[in-house]
Each structure stands twice: as structure tokens, then as C-alpha cells.
């Protein structure tokens, strides 16, 4: 049931998952780990969240968005082979049984020797390993693919170009996005 | 080591209120879920509730609405507030420790505190 | 809820035979490929001790004779030469789902 995500040996992977704060500030620990989400904690944490900060970290494992306006989506750098896998996304509401948890594969492909490709204007061609499952599967809402070649002003041009679109609209609320409070 | 250290059981009625505590050492206690295990004389082992290192709390539907977890992990304490009991909940408390990266199993347990709800 | 039903209630056992003790689930406790599944000993007064977790794992400091194996709904521990520190009651129980259930026990007694 989990979603998958794709780079390339070397690239930096990304692995989406939000929450929404019910306050400016007002955060929720969260964890990730190697591995499936278990009953209660995050596998093998790699990263964690507190409500305030960042508490524990690995090497190759950041946050490049916003964590505290609750873009908790992981990074890790310079992959390997051995980085596939099955990652858990954590986010511990606090209440009774109110955790969210996703599980989210990675699957790292060996790096292309051939150069890389200039930006399409086809946009399955520019995104070819783009996931457009948002809302097929059991997960309350399910996610884009790492696209590594492409950066975030590329994408932005080319989703206003689609904006009438389904891709378009998978595009824009990509992310597994939970609302607290 | 690791230690686990329940306190705070006795005697209470049926419809009273009691609070266990359980004071644990040696491991970084904040890392952990942490859960409560309880055992009626001569019977088997029930889990009576967890809580992840985050906050998160969990309950099955025997004790929901009258058990509540907390943990203060500054005093690395764990503790068990029990409201409304009744004579089905007389057992030998345990704390215990969920097994880091996972909290659903449990390497190490406390001696237990025994709770006896009687008129 | 998950119900772990374990088989026999009491199992007599001389020392030095090889005991073997029965776990089943209503439903799989399978998770990308492990079995949450854990096996403990208790002793009288005392608390229980984890030997056995993710079905198969024989948790640090407990002796080689104990062993578990299994998958999906049905789990076995087995102790291959019962020594007398190993006389107790066992209970399995899951990690799968909340809420986290055991086993009603087996009794290992000395025959």
C-alpha cells in the first residue's frame, strides 16, 4: 500500500510528507526511519522532530523544507543502492491513537551514463518517473515522485501551462498532507 | 542497567481513583515508547497502555475513558492515572519498556505493583 | 482485536526433552516481510522476560535451546533440551495491531 519514489545513484532522493500546524509554532514531533512504520515509533529513526526543533539527525538525512510550518518531507543525500527500501513518515499528534503514519518506498535505480535531458516541453517526457496516484490507493492521499533533473521554478512553469489539467492538479496538492486542529 | 520501578499501588474501592508511577534509569528514557502491562492474580498478561515517545497515547476498549498515560521525561517517570475501577481491574501492574525503534515488545519490565479494588 | 490462542495449556515435560509450544493468531501478523510475533517466560513472583521477537529472534542473553519460528497466523517456540531454570509459564503475543494481545499461556511443567 505504500508509494513509491524514485532517483538515481548519487542524486539527492526526496521522500514527501506534511502536516498542517494548528498554530504558527505549534508543532508536532515527528519521526523517520528505515524501514516500516511499527505500532507505536519509526523503525530505525534516521530523523526526528520535536516541538520546537530538530533533535536528532543522521547524516544524509535533513529536512530541506519548512518543518515548522509542517513540511517534513525528507532528503537524503548522495544515494546508494543500499538506501532503497521502505521509509516510515511519522507524525505523532498528540491525543489517544491519533499518530499518522506513511510508509513510503524508495526504489533507487543505477545512474544513466547518458547526459542528462533538456527540459520538454511533452510533459511526460520531462516527467518521466512523475507518480500520479493521488487518491488510488489506500493512503488518504498519496504523492509525486523525486524529480531530481528538474527544478522547482521548471515545475512551476510547466504546471501553469497545465493548470486545466489532472497532472496539474496532482502536481499542486502533491504531498501527504494531514490537518491538525 | 536498566531499571524499572512501579510504586503507588494498594487498596481503593470500587469507583475510586489510584495513580502508579514508575521511575525508570539507565537509558535515555524520552527515546521510548513505554506501556503498561497488567496481570489479575492466577491469569495471563493484558497491555493496558502505551505511550510513543512522542506523546501519542493508546488504549484497548477495556480501559479507554477510565485509564489516561503520561510520562514526564525530565523526571523520567511513566505513570498510570486509573479512574472509575472496579474489581476486574485487581492485577499486578507492570511497567515496561517498549524495545527502541518499535514499542510494540517489550525488553524490560519492572517487579510490578499490585492493585486490589475491593469494598 | 487479534486473539493469540496457545496450545497445550499445560505441556509435562522431563528435563533434557525438547518441549514444543503452539501460538495462533486470527490473523496474520505479517508486515513487509516480518512476523510480529514475540515469545516470553515467566517464572512465579516475577516479571516476564523476553526470549523471542519478530518470531525468530532470540533476544540477547537468552540460551541458544530456545528458538522460535512461524510465520502468518501460526508460531511455534521450542525449547530443544528443557533444563529445570525452564520450567514457567510462555506467552506469545503481537506487535501488529492495537490493541498489542497475548497468548493465554502454557504451562511448562516438569513431568
Known amino acids: 500500500s505504500e508509494v513509491e519514489y524514485r532517483a538515481e545513484v548519487g542524486q539527492n532522493a526526496y521522500l514527501p510528507c506534511f502536516y498542517t500546524p494548528a498554530a504558527p509554532g505549534n508543532l508536532v514531533p515527528v519521526c523517520w526511519g528505515k524501514g516500516a512504520c511499527p505500532v507505536f515509533e519509526c523503525g530505525n529513526v534516521v530523523l526526528r522532530t520535536d516541538e520546537r526543533d530538530v533533535n536528532y539527525w543522521t547524516s544524509r538525512y535533513w529536512l530541506n523544507g519548512d518543518f515548522r510550518k509542517g513540511d517534513v518531507s525528507l532528503t537524503i543525500e548522495n544515494v546508494t543502492l543500499a538506501d532503497s527500501g521502505i521509509y516510515c513518515c511519522r507524525i505523532q499528534i498528540p491525543g489517544i491513537m491519533n499518530d499518522e503514519k506513511f510508509n513510503l518506498k524508495l526504489v533507487i535505480k543505477p545512474a544513466k551514463v547518458t547526459p542528462a535531458p533538456t527540459l520538454q516541453r511533452d510533459f511526460t517526457a520531462a516527467f518521466p518517473r512523475m507518480l500520479t496516484t493521488r487518491g488510488h490507493g489506500p493512503a488518504e492521499t498519496q504523492t509525486l515522485g523525486s524529480l531530481p533533473d528538474i527544478n522547482l521554478t521548471q515545475i512551476s512553469t510547466l504546471a501553469n501551462e497545465l493548470r486545466d489539467s489532472r497532472l496539474a492538479n496532482d502536481l499542486r496538492d502533491s504531498g501527504a498532507t494531514i490537518r491538525i486542529g | 542497567e536498566v531499571q524499572l520501578v512501579e510504586s503507588g499501588g494498594g487498596l481503593v474501592q470500587p469507583g475510586g481513583s489510584l495513580r502508579l508511577s514508575c521511575a525508570a534509569s539507565g537509558f535515555t528514557f524520552s527515546r521510548y515508547a513505554m506501556s503498561w502491562v497488567r496481570q489479575a492474580p492466577g491469569k495471563g498478561l493484558e497491555w493496558v497502555a502505551a505511550?510513543?515517545?512522542?506523546?501519542?497515547?493508546y488504549f484497548p476498549d477495556s480501559v479507554k475513558g477510565r485509564f489516561t498515560i503520561s510520562r514526564d521525561n525530565a523526571k523520567n517517570s511513566l505513570y498510570l492515572q486509573m479512574n472509575s475501577l472496579r474489581a476486574e481491574d485487581t492485577a499486578v501492574y507492570y511497567c515496561a519498556r517498549g524495545r527502541e525503534a518499535d514499542g510494540g515488545y517489550f525488553d524490560y519490565w519492572g517487579q510490578g505493583t499490585l492493585v486490589t479494588v475491593s469494598s | 482485536d487479534i486473539v493469540l490462542t496457545q496450545s497445550p495449556a499445560t505441556l509435562s515435560v522431563s528435563p533434557g526433552e525438547r518441549a514444543t509450544l503452539s501460538c495462533r493468531a486470527s490473523?496474520?501478523?505479517?508486515?513487509?516481510?516480518?512476523?510480529?510475533m514475540q515469545w516470553y517466560q515467566q517464572k512465579p513472583g516475577q516479571a516476564p522476560r523476553l526470549l523471542i521477537y519478530?518470531?525468530?529472534n532470540v533476544e540477547s542473553g537468552v540460551p541458544a535451546r530456545f528458538s522460535g519460528s512461524g510465520s502468518g497466523t501460526d508460531f511455534t517456540l521450542t525449547i530443544s533440551s528443557l533444563q529445570s531454570e525452564d520450567f514457567a509459564v510462555y506467552y506469545c503475543q503481537q506487535s501488529m495491531k492495537v490493541p498489542l494481545t497475548f497468548g493465554g499461556g502454557t504451562k511448562v511443567e516438569i513431568k
Open positions: 519478530a518470531a525468530s
Open positions: 505511550i510513543s515517545s512522542g506523546g501519542s497515547l
Open positions: 490473523e496474520s501478523v505479517e508486515y513487509y516481510g516480518t512476523s510480529l
